[in-house]
């Protein structure tokens, strides 16, 4: 089969999530995603990004915060916070545009 798409140099990242196959992964960039679902404590996942870099530009909300970086294991010690709860009229959207 033909080779996979050329995506430039890959970086090694810390991988900490239920779907990690090991302690590290390789991708175009490293990610940290902090998510709070209704009625649950926030969960922080670390991993690799290869697609839809626009999510890295999204503003933090009371439910989610995305962080991206581009160097070796750069996501290892990053800690994220969520926005404080705001009145509905002031809530930032999660839309990455």
């Amino acid at each position: 089969d033909p080779v996979k798409p050329s995506r430039g140099p890959l970086v090694t990242c810390t991988c900490e999530s239920p779907h990690c196959k090991g302690p590290t992964c390789r991708g175009a960039w490293c990610t940290v995603v902090l998510v709070r679902e209704e009625g649950r404590h926030p969960q922080e996942h670390r991993g690799c990004g290869n697609l839809h870099r626009e999510l890295c530009r999204g503003r933090p909300t009371e439910f989610v915060n995305h962080y991206c970086c581009d160097s070796h294991l750069c996501n290892h010690n990053v800690s994220l916070v969520l926005e404080a709860t705001q009145p509905p009229s002031e809530q930032p959207g999660t839309d990455g545009q």
Epitope: G8, V35, R53
Partner: antibody, heavy 118, light 108 residues
Framework: QVQLQESGPGLVKPSQTLSLTCTVS??????????WNWIRQHPGKGLEWIGY???????YYNPSLKSRVTISVDTSKNQFSLKLSSVTAADTAVYYC??????????WGQGTTVTVSS | ESVLTQSPGTLSLSPGERATLSCRAS???????LAWYQQKPGQAPRLLIY???SRATGIPDRFSGSGSGTDFTLTISRLEPEDFAVYYC?????????FGQGTRLEIK
């Protein structure tokens, strides 16, 4: 293997909100490797991308529809949903949900036809 | 936003012939995230090619993709009766995701 199934009303009145749900079976919607998309196809026309949602709840929408679209995810039910407000006859289409990764949109629902009419 | 233009709009060929479908992007496709889909009447699109040239699972090797930058090609080396359908290219490297308008491959 992973399968997607769209569900929702087949008939919506003008000015109302179209609501559809996509149920994911055979795999977890919470995988960080995938993005969950809505696409539509007007009768006899091509494919129009509506938007996607990530497991985190982060979204990105087609700029031409952004003001009317909301996509949400319910990881506990392994579902994601589409809401399109203020519909007109021009929103009559077949609506598809699809799973996307670096390997393209490899899994699609069978599509559901939505007609906007009074 | 990357606009994808497919040509020709309709291609009339006979089984056994070679089909060449073109897709041109208005700007360079990010990280080679260019896919091709086949759609038959009343069915959902089916992924054929992703990442410009990688065949999706279960796709016969008569389908191949090539190209780079802004110009891409889907080639069907020897047409089978079941290949007559509409084909769409898609870029998914940067949002908004966009599709070409489609090429209809019909039996001559």
């Amino acid at each position: 293997q992973v399968q997607l199934q769209e569900s929702g009303p087949g008939l919506v009145k003008p000015s109302q909100t179209l609501s559809l749900t996509c149920t994911v079976s055979g795999g977890s919607i919470s995988s960080g490797d995938y993005y969950w998309n809505w696409i539509r196809q007007h009768p006899g026309k091509g494919l129009e991308w509506i938007g996607y949602i990530y497991y985190s709840g982060s979204t990105y929408y087609n700029p031409s529809l952004k003001s009317r679209v909301t996509i949400s995810v319910d990881t506990s039910k392994n579902q994601f949903s589409l809401k399109l407000s203020s519909v007109t006859a021009a929103d009559t289409a077949v609506y598809y949900c699809a799973r996307e990764s670096t390997d393209g949109m490899d899994v699609w629902g069978q599509g559901t036809t939505v007609t906007v009419s009074s | 936003e990357s606009v994808l233009t497919q040509s020709p709009g309709t291609l009339s060929l006979s089984p056994g012939e070679r089909a060449t479908l073109s897709c041109r992007a208005s700007q360079s496709v990010s990280s080679s995230y260019l896919a091709w889909y086949q759609q038959k009447p009343g069915q959902a699109p089916r992924l054929l090619i992703y990442g410009v040239s990688s065949r999706a699972t279960g796709i016969p090797d008569r389908f191949s993709g090539s190209g780079s930058g802004t110009d891409f090609t889907l080639t069907i080396s020897r047409l089978e009766p079941e290949d007559f359908a509409v084909y769409y290219c898609q870029q998914y490297g940067s949002s908004p995701i966009t599709f070409g308008q489609g090429t209809r491959l019909e039996i001559k």
